[in-house]
Structure formats: structure tokens, C-alpha cells
């Protein structure tokens, strides 16, 4: 029996499905205009040439005109995600066009088969778009496509495929099998539009990565390292998703980078930063909270477009659920030991104290390890605003916390069993804040006591005299 | 108004084959998924599967799988349920009813339902 | 597949008073913020009749005396007050992004 094909070629070919009794010739791309925030309301189709629906559904020339772009489904049907975007942008913009690109029968295939429907999907884009240019007011400069996974590949098509530039694509965890490393042509790149940024959220070191591990964009965007995801780990997925499995984490990871997009959108108040940096080691050692030299920018819808910069990569830490913002804190700390204990490798912890509130015990994470009689620079974030930064505490976890720092004490203790007591003098601690880019210098209250072994404490407040205090003579304060 | 209107029950023995419509009304046939869920005499409800209704690509649930067939005339504004190789377990009550691509998923309008007997 | 359990399988609640009926999932239902939970009513020889989405909203038509509640894997729906026409069996149903999506065993509720 016919089935459905358009200009794209025959959908029954593409599907590998029972064929339906149909008879009609249908396209098998669908752009649905969502013309209310209600999820359940069935909006209006448009198709290429009929004018008439434009009328009907109130479509805005002069407005922005978004186009969402699903990827690969195992389901067949729209992921709830797709409601949230869409309601999120028309809180955000009322006036705009929001417009759901359905091509879930292409969609709805084995992988490798959806990736071979992404070019005639971004054919489909670039020919609707072609045809709205015809119209009076219309401009290409207020289109941005948002696609997520193979979605954001189907948009760098339309992108590339358009008379003309479009304004902006946002790439949401574009996918990462069979994209990785090919030909910008094939795949999401600068080239695609005006601007194109990207969310990077689930993009695996090893094995295979459902996320783009390479930088596709002007800027690319990679929360938490691009990798592993706050609130997403098996015991978090566990106790609140549907489905308490891998395929869940994997999920969970991979769709973050929609709810970060949500998240710019209707948390304005309260924006995230992400700071470029030339890996995640690098950024997890705090080495990268400058704003300098456009080095920062805002993740999600409200990104500063940055046309100089191609495949700058950029990094941030985010809390598990929405609103994601959190406060990062660059740490300056010059470790000095009179007992040249090499192998020492405290596990520190320290606590903010500010004005509108303090923070948890934060850890200072060692990424590589502690260089003694140098200064060691580490990252820490609160989810809170802590306001002006007034005192802290370092703290040295004692020998019982843990089983680890009991073997490592063990260790050290056989490494060095002449000199069982350890020591480190710390004299000052510089903080930057990366969100104020204020920078302050905090001393020890007691410059006399500036000690401290496993189990003690350490308090550090503003110094006196600010940046100068600096004494020549002092093996403490070698400050890079 | 919106409608879902199935065809009138049938008796069938076992092997035989059935095959149940569900015209749909007072609405855009291909903007809405439809349903198949049934129900055995005394017992609970039982989700099918589903068919997009523009497409024409089925989902069928596990245990539905081979002698079920979900199909549509789209210019008719009519799904089908075709049932092969009828068991007596078959018989039971089948209902169709639609849900919102857009929305969260949830059954808002039902046909009557198609009661079906299959018995030697 | 996840797994409804209703409880209770029957009751019967005077005219008047308050009909509490209780739906357990094996997994959450929630999916950022929201509880893909439906509930429907069905009387003998009739389809069932949409009451309760997404959890805690209201169906068209249907008459506030119709509630529901809840989140994660418990969800709870309220008749109140009673009357003769809610004598019927409801039905609790998930609708998560991931399919199969699967009905609850039912609850018949009986007017007094």
C-alpha cells in the first residue's frame, strides 16, 4: 500500500517500519508553530508555500523566530523536555515565533539511520526558511536554531544549506558518534551562523561519548568538565527519574545541557559564568577565573556573541538542579613545610565566611598534587552568594575521616618515620571571585601562628594592609 | 465536538481475524497519537501501543507484538486495529483513544470501546 | 516497565464524606518538577473518562470536587464531597517520555 514521501525522497525507505494505509504525499518534516505555552494546545502547521496559516496563527515577521530541533528518539514521541523549552522561551520572549521541527518518522530509526536523515532534515529547515525570507520583514538575522543531540548536526545543516546567514544556533550536547572529527561540513561549525554557541554535557573521555567531545562553535561550553553531571550520578537517577538505570544517567547527563538553556532563560537573575580555559585539569585547578580579554561569558540565551573567537572552549561549575548558578572562588594558597615533607598531601578543607552567608566545608581538590614551599592554586564554589568575603577557616582532615587518608597517613608515616609529626605554614590565602572578579588577600589573625597539622583548624582574616603586605625576608610568602 | 467512534462488536472464532475502526471527529486526525488499550472482561486497563496518526509509524507494547497490527486512512480521519490469528484470550473490550504530541501524554478524549468475543 | 499499585481495591464511602484513593509506582514519575500521573474514572459499559493530569491538574469538564496529589512514586486522588454519580472504578496511569506506559490495577468505589 502507498505510504508517505515528499521532496526529501520516500519515507517508507527511511523508517524500516509496517507501512500504514495512507495515500496522501506528505513531507516528512513537520514545523509546528506553538502558539500558546499550554503543551497540550496543537498549535499550527506551516508548510512551504501556503501563506495562509502565517495569517491564521498570528505569525510576527518583524519578531525572533526560534526554531527547536528534537534528535534521535527510541520512543517515537516528544521527551518532556520539548515542552519545557518551548514554554520557557515564550516566558522569555512573548512576542517571538517558537517553532518545533518534528521529524521524529526520521528520527524514530536505528542511529545510523538518523544520522543520514540529518541533511535532508537541515534541507527541510533551510527551504522553510528560504520561503519565509520572501516575506516582507522578515530577517535571517533574528532566526536561532536550537537543537539538541542530532538536533543541533540537523541545524548546522539548515545553517549551511540557507540563502543567507542565520543569527545564532545553540548546539545542546550536540551528538558525538559518527560526528566526532569529520569535515565541518558534516557536522555543526562556526560557519553554520552569525553565532554559534554550545552546552557540552555529556562528552566521555573514553569509550563512547553520546556528546561532541570537540569544540563545534565560536564558544563551547562545558559545565562541570563536560562530563560528569551533579544530581545525575546512579544514586541520584536512582531515587528521582523514571527508570533508575544506566540509560537514565545517560539521559540525565546528555539532557542537562536543555536545562541549562531553560534555566538562562527563566532564571535571569540569576545567570551562570563560564570562564575560557584551555582543558578541565586546568579549570578544576582554578588557573582560569579571568574576565579579561573577553575571557567569561554567560552560558545558555543570554551568551554575549563572540564572533572573534572560534572553538574557544570554556568551563563552569553548576549545582544538580535548577537554578543552576554557583559562585566560583579561585584560591591562591603558598604551602611552606620546614620538614621538606615531599609526599604530604593534606586533604584540606576550607569554609567562607561572608556577609549574607557562609558556605559549607568546601574541599580543596587536589588535581594533580600539593607542591610544597610554592603557591598551590585550587577552585571552589558555593551555591550560595556569599556577599563580601570576611574570614575563613582551613581545616586539615584528621587521620580517622577516612580510609584513604588513614592509608595515606600510614603511607607517610613509613616514608618518613623519623618525623611522624606534620606541619605546613600558611601565612595568606588570595581569593578571587570569578562573578565579581574581586580579588582579596586574607591573613592568619596571629601571624605568630601560621601552623597547622592533621586535625587543626587555621583562621584567616582580610589583611590590614591589602595587597602590600609582603615581607622579603619570609620563606611564607612567595606569592605567584 | 470531539469524537471517537469505534465499530460494533464481533464475534469471531480462534484463527480467524479481526480487524476494529475508530473514526476519528472535531479535530485535526494527524495532529494527535492515537492509542490502543484493552481490557479483558473484570480485569484492568492495558496500554497497546500507540500509531502516529501522520506518519503512520506504529509502537507496540511487548506484549502485543506480532499478531496486532496498528494502521490508519488518514483521509478517512480513521485508525484500525487488526487483530491475526485470534486466541481466546483476545476477547476483551479494546478502546482507542488520543493524546496531545505536544503535551504530557495523558488519554483526553476515548472511543466507546469495541467489544470483541472470540470463542469455537 | 514501571508498575501501578492501587490501594484500596474497594471501598465504600458514605454520600457526603471523603473517598481517598492511593497509587504507588515501582519508580519515579517525576521528571524536572512535574509528575506524569493521570487519573480516570470508568463506569460499567462506558470508556474511561479523563479526571486528573499530570498529577495535581484538572481534566475538562470535570467538577473540583476531584483532586489530586502527590509526587515521585505516591500519588493520592480525593473525592470530596461524595456523590452518588462517582461510583465508579479510577484508575491511576504513568505517561513518562519513555514508554510502555501502564494503568494501575484499579479502585472500585462504592456509595454508601
Known amino acids: 500500500s502507498p505510504v508517505p514521501f515528499g521532496p526529501e525522497g520516500r519515507l517508507e525507505d527511511k523508517l524500516h517500519k509496517p507501512k500504514a494505509t495512507q495515500t496522501e504525499v506528505k513531507p516528512s518534516v513537520r514545523f509546528n508553530l506553538r502558539t500558546s505555552k499550554d503543551p497540550e494546545h496543537e498549535g499550527c502547521y506551516l508548510s512551504v508555500g501556503h501563506s495562509q496559516p502565517l495569517e491564521d496563527c498570528s505569525f510576527n515577521m518583524t519578531a525572533k523566530t526560534f526554531f527547536i530541533i528534537h534528535g534521535w528518539t527510541m520512543s517515537g514521541i516528544f521527551e518532556n523536555w520539548l515542552h519545557k523549552l518551548v514554554s520557557a522561551l515564550h516566558t522569555r520572549e512573548k512576542d517571538a515565533n517558537v517553532v518545533v521541527v518534528d521529524w521524529l518518522p526520521l528520527a524514530h530509526q536505528l542511529y545510523t539511520d538518523a544520522v543520514n536523515n540529518t541533511r535532508v532534515v537541515g534541507h527541510s529547515i533551510a527551504r522553510m526558511l528560504d520561503w519565509l525570507q520572501e516575506k516582507d520583514d522578515f530577517s535571517l538575522g533574528n532566526v536561532h536554531l536550537i537543537g539538541y543531540s542530532l538536533g543541533a548536526h540537523v541545524a548546522g545543516y539548515a545553517g549551511n544549506f540557507v540563502k543567507g546567514t542565520v543569527g545564532r544556533i545553540t548546539g545542546l550536547d550536540p551528538a558525538g558518534p559518527m560526528f566526532e572529527g569529520v569535515d565541518i561540513n558534516r557536522r555543526l561549525s562556526p560557519d553554520d551562523a552569525d553565532f554559534v554557541d554550545v552546552l557540552h554535557t555529556y562528552t566521555l573521555s573514553f569509550g563512547l561519548s553520546i556528546g561532541i567531545r570537540m569544540p563545534v562553535g565560536h564558544i563551547d561550553i562545558y559545565p562541570n568538565g563536560g562530563d560528569f553531571q551533579p544530581g545525575c550520578g546512579f544514586n541520584d537517577v536512582i531515587g528521582s527519574f523514571a527508570y533508575g538505570t544506566i540509560s537514565e544517567m545517560v539521559k540525565c547527563e546528555h539532557e542537562r545541557a536543555v536545562h541549562l538553556f531553560v534555566d538562562s532563560l527563566v532564571n535571569q537573575d540569576k545567570p551562570s559564568f563560564a570562564f575560557q580555559c584551555t582543558d578541565s585539569s586546568r579549570f578544576k585547578r582554578g588557573i582560569c577565573l579571568s574576565c579579561r580579554k573577553n575571557r567569561c561569558n554567560n552560558i545558555g540565551y543570554n551568551a554575549k556573541k563572540m564572533r572573534k573567537k572560534r572553538n574557544s572552549k570554556m568551563y563552569l561549575k553548576t549545582r544538580a538542579g535548577m537554578p543552576f548558578k554557583v559562585y566560583h572562588y579561585q584560591l591562591k594558597v603558598h604551602m611552606f613545610s620546614y620538614n621538606n615533607s615531599g609526599d604530604t598531601q593534606p586533604t584540606l578543607y576550607i569554609t567562607l565566611y561572608g556577609s549574607n552567608a557562609d558556605s559549607q566545608n568546601l574541599p580543596l581538590e587536589i588535581v594533580e598534587k600539593i607542591e610544597l614551599n610554592a603557591t598551590n592554586t585550587f577552585l571552589v564554589y558555593t551555591e550560595e552568594d556569599l556577599g563580601d568575603l570576611l574570614k575563613m577557616r582551613l581545616t586539615w582532615e584528621g587521620v580517622a575521616h577516612s580510609w584513604y587518608n588513614l592509608w595515606n597517613e600510614f603511607r607517610n608515616y613509613l616514608s618518613q618515620p623519623s618525623n611522624p609529626s606534620r606541619e605546613l605554614y600558611i601565612r595568606r590565602i588570595r581569593v578571587k571571585s570569578g562573578e565579581t572578579q574581586r580579588k582579596v588577600t586574607f591573613c592568619t589573625q596571629d601571624p605568630t601562628k601560621s601552623s597547622i597539622s592533621p586535625g587543626q583548624e587555621l583562621w584567616f582574616h582580610k589583611c590590614q594592609d591589602g595587597w602590600k603586605m609582603k615581607n622579603k625576608t619570609s620563606p611564607f610568602v612567595n606569592l605567584a | 465536538q470531539i469524537q471517537l467512534v469505534q465499530s460494533g462488536p464481533e464475534l469471531k472464532k480462534p484463527g480467524e481475524t479481526v480487524k476494529i475502526s475508530c473514526k476519528a471527529s472535531?479535530?485535526?486526525?494527524?495532529?494527535?497519537?492515537m492509542n490502543w488499550v484493552k481490557q479483558a472482561p473484570g480485569k484492568d486497563l492495558k496500554w497497546m501501543g500507540w500509531?502516529?496518526?501522520?506518519?503512520?509509524?506504529?509502537t507496540y507494547a511487548d506484549d502485543f507484538k506480532g499478531r496486532f497490527a496498528f494502521s490508519l486512512e488518514t483521509s478517512a480521519s480513521t485508525a484500525y486495529l487488526q487483530i491475526n490469528n485470534l486466541k481466546n484470550e483476545d476477547t476483551a473490550t479494546y478502546f482507542c483513544?488520543?493524546?496531545?504530541?505536544?503535551?504530557?501524554?495523558?488519554?483526553?478524549?476515548w472511543g466507546q470501546g469495541t467489544t470483541l468475543t472470540v470463542s469455537s | 516497565d514501571i508498575v501501578l499499585t492501587q490501594s484500596p481495591a474497594s471501598l465504600a464511602v458514605s454520600l457526603g464524606q471523603r473517598a481517598t484513593i492511593s497509587c504507588k509506582a515501582s519508580?519515579?514519575?517525576?521528571?524536572?518538577?512535574?509528575?506524569?500521573m493521570n487519573w480516570y474514572q470508568q463506569k460499567p459499559g462506558q470508556p474511561p473518562q479523563l479526571l486528573i493530569y499530570?498529577?495535581?491538574n484538572l481534566g475538562s469538564g470535570i467538577p473540583a470536587r476531584f483532586s489530586g496529589s502527590g509526587s515521585g512514586t505516591d500519588f493520592t486522588l480525593n473525592i470530596h464531597p461524595v456523590e452518588e454519580e462517582d461510583a465508579a472504578t479510577y484508575y491511576c496511569?504513568?505517561?513518562?517520555?519513555?514508554?510502555?506506559?501502564?494503568f494501575g490495577g484499579g479502585t472500585k468505589l462504592e456509595i454508601k
Open positions: 483513544a488520543r493524546f496531545s504530541y505536544y503535551g504530557r501524554h495523558y488519554f483526553d478524549y
Open positions: 472535531g479535530y485535526t486526525f494527524t495532529n494527535y497519537g
Open positions: 500509531i502516529n496518526t501522520y506518519s503512520g509509524v506504529p
Open positions: 519508580q519515579s514519575v517525576d521528571y524536572d518538577g512535574d509528575s506524569y
Open positions: 499530570a498529577a495535581s
Open positions: 496511569h504513568q505517561s513518562t517520555d519513555d514508554p510502555p506506559w501502564t
